[in-house]
Interface confidence: medium
């Protein structure tokens, strides 16, 4: 379990401010919703609504919140220790192997087929031979999850020092 | 909703160890800590060690060191508390916990008896 | 490893009282104090974190306070559901350790 964390993925370096809470780290180690100081001496929150960190963590930094693109609803928010969850708008998909838009589903199926499956955020329609019952070609498999982030966001441990 | 659920009472024979399981459903396991907190009889609460299953690291406290073992398997959202050499004293509830700091969800409780 | 000593080992107190539990650390802490609430046969629960900061859900009555060595945990009035054994626990350092409890009962 490893994530590559790119400079993107980084709030922008912030001082302590007053409302940010520090606790003293533990082996060197922060807690989820926390990141740590410069100096090694602190764990500092994360700003509700701005950034997050999801595990225990030597980041100097939490983790921006992703914002959902249009297109998009919003699942649940971003807060100190979860990412915000977006989800595609009704009508559109997630693909597998394009994760970074919505597509819109197909209206029907093509001629001599009937639909099996319903449109989802995370699959399109899904469409079968009438006779024989095999799957359309260009069926696009069911992701299991649905809960999406934006490219970079790790969804696995980060840890700076491995 | 975290769910920290842990295995049935035991009862044990001085100088044996005992084997405590605790499964999390219902969040991300790997991403806090798991501390096991004992409580004897009639007694406080005392933090015997943690293990932060990302990292796979355990620490300890003095007492127990030598004669506890946790350790996480990520793949069920298993943790497992090991004590050793038990004596009479080691009769106690042990409680896991999720742990960030402070412990906001604990376990149900084991009851380890240890008696000849 | 850090001593954390609670007094009074108990006490006795009405519905409707204020009751002021302390907790005394061997060396300075910092903020870095939890309290936690625990009733006979049930597991702890967590009341305050960080010296003073109230766990969702915890009613307003409990509040905390201090820094360094001394910590108090303040209940302004106390209600039924109230009595049981108050714990104070610090994270500064490994090992985390807990005070011996302080239980509050029915005057």
């Known amino acids: 379990e490893s994530a590559l964390i790119t400079q993107q993925d980084l709030a922008p370096q912030q001082r302590a401010a007053p409302q940010q809470k520090r606790s003293s780290p533990s082996e060197g180690l922060c807690p989820p919703g926390h990141h740590i100081s410069e100096d090694g001496r602190d764990c500092i929150s994360c700003k509700y609504g701005q950034d997050y960190s999801t595990h225990w963590n030597d980041l100097l930094f939490c983790l921006r919140c992703t914002r959902c693109d249009s297109g998009e609803v919003e699942l649940s928010p971003c807060t100190t220790t979860r990412n915000t969850v977006c989800q595609c708008e009704e009508g559109t998909f997630r693909e597998e192997d394009s994760p970074e838009m919505c597509r819109k589903c197909r209206t029907g199926c093509p001629r001599g087929m009937v639909k099996v499956g319903d449109c989802t955020p995370w699959s399109d329609i899904e469409c079968v031979h009438k006779e024989s019952g095999t799957k359309h070609s260009g069926e696009v498999p069911a992701v299991e999850e649905t809960v999406t982030s934006s490219p970079g966001t790790p969804a696995s441990p980060c840890s700076l020092s491995g | 909703q975290v769910q920290l659920v842990q295995s049935g009472a035991e009862v044990k024979k001085p100088g044996s160890s005992v084997k405590v399981s605790c499964k999390a459903s219902?969040?991300?396991?790997?991403?806090?800590?798991i501390s096991w907190v004992r409580q004897a009889p009639g007694q406080g609460l005392e933090w015997m060690g943690r293990?932060?299953?990302?990292?796979?690291?355990?620490n300890y406290a003095q007492k127990f060191q030598g004669r506890v073992t946790i350790t996480a398997d990520k793949s069920t959202s298993t943790a497992y508390m090991e004590l050793s050499s038990l004596r009479s004293e080691d009769t106690a509830v042990y409680y896991c916990?999720?742990?960030?700091?402070?412990?906001?969800?604990w376990g149900q409780g084991t009851t380890v008896t240890v008696s000849s | 490893d850090i001593q954390m000593t609670q007094s009074p080992s108990s006490l006795s107190a009405s519905v409707g009282d204020r009751v002021t539990i302390t907790c005394s650390a061997s060396?300075?802490?910092?903020?870095?104090l939890n309290w936690y609430q625990q009733k006979p046969g049930k597991a702890p629960k967590l009341l305050i974190y960080?010296?003073?900061s109230l766990h969702s859900g915890v009613p307003s009555r409990f509040s905390g306070s201090g820094s360094g060595t001394d910590f108090t945990l303040t209940i302004s009035s106390l209600q039924p559901e109230d009595f049981a054994t108050y714990y104070c626990?610090?994270?500064?350092?490994?090992?985390?350790?807990f005070g011996q409890g302080t239980k509050v009962e029915i005057k």
């Open positions: 916990a999720r742990e960030g700091f402070y412990i906001d969800y």
């Open positions: 219902g969040g991300t396991f790997s991403s806090y800590a």
């Open positions: 293990i932060i299953p990302i990292f796979g690291t355990a």
């Open positions: 060396q300075g802490i910092r903020n870095y």
């Open positions: 960080y010296t003073s």
């Open positions: 626990q610090q994270y500064s350092k490994l090992p985390w350790t």
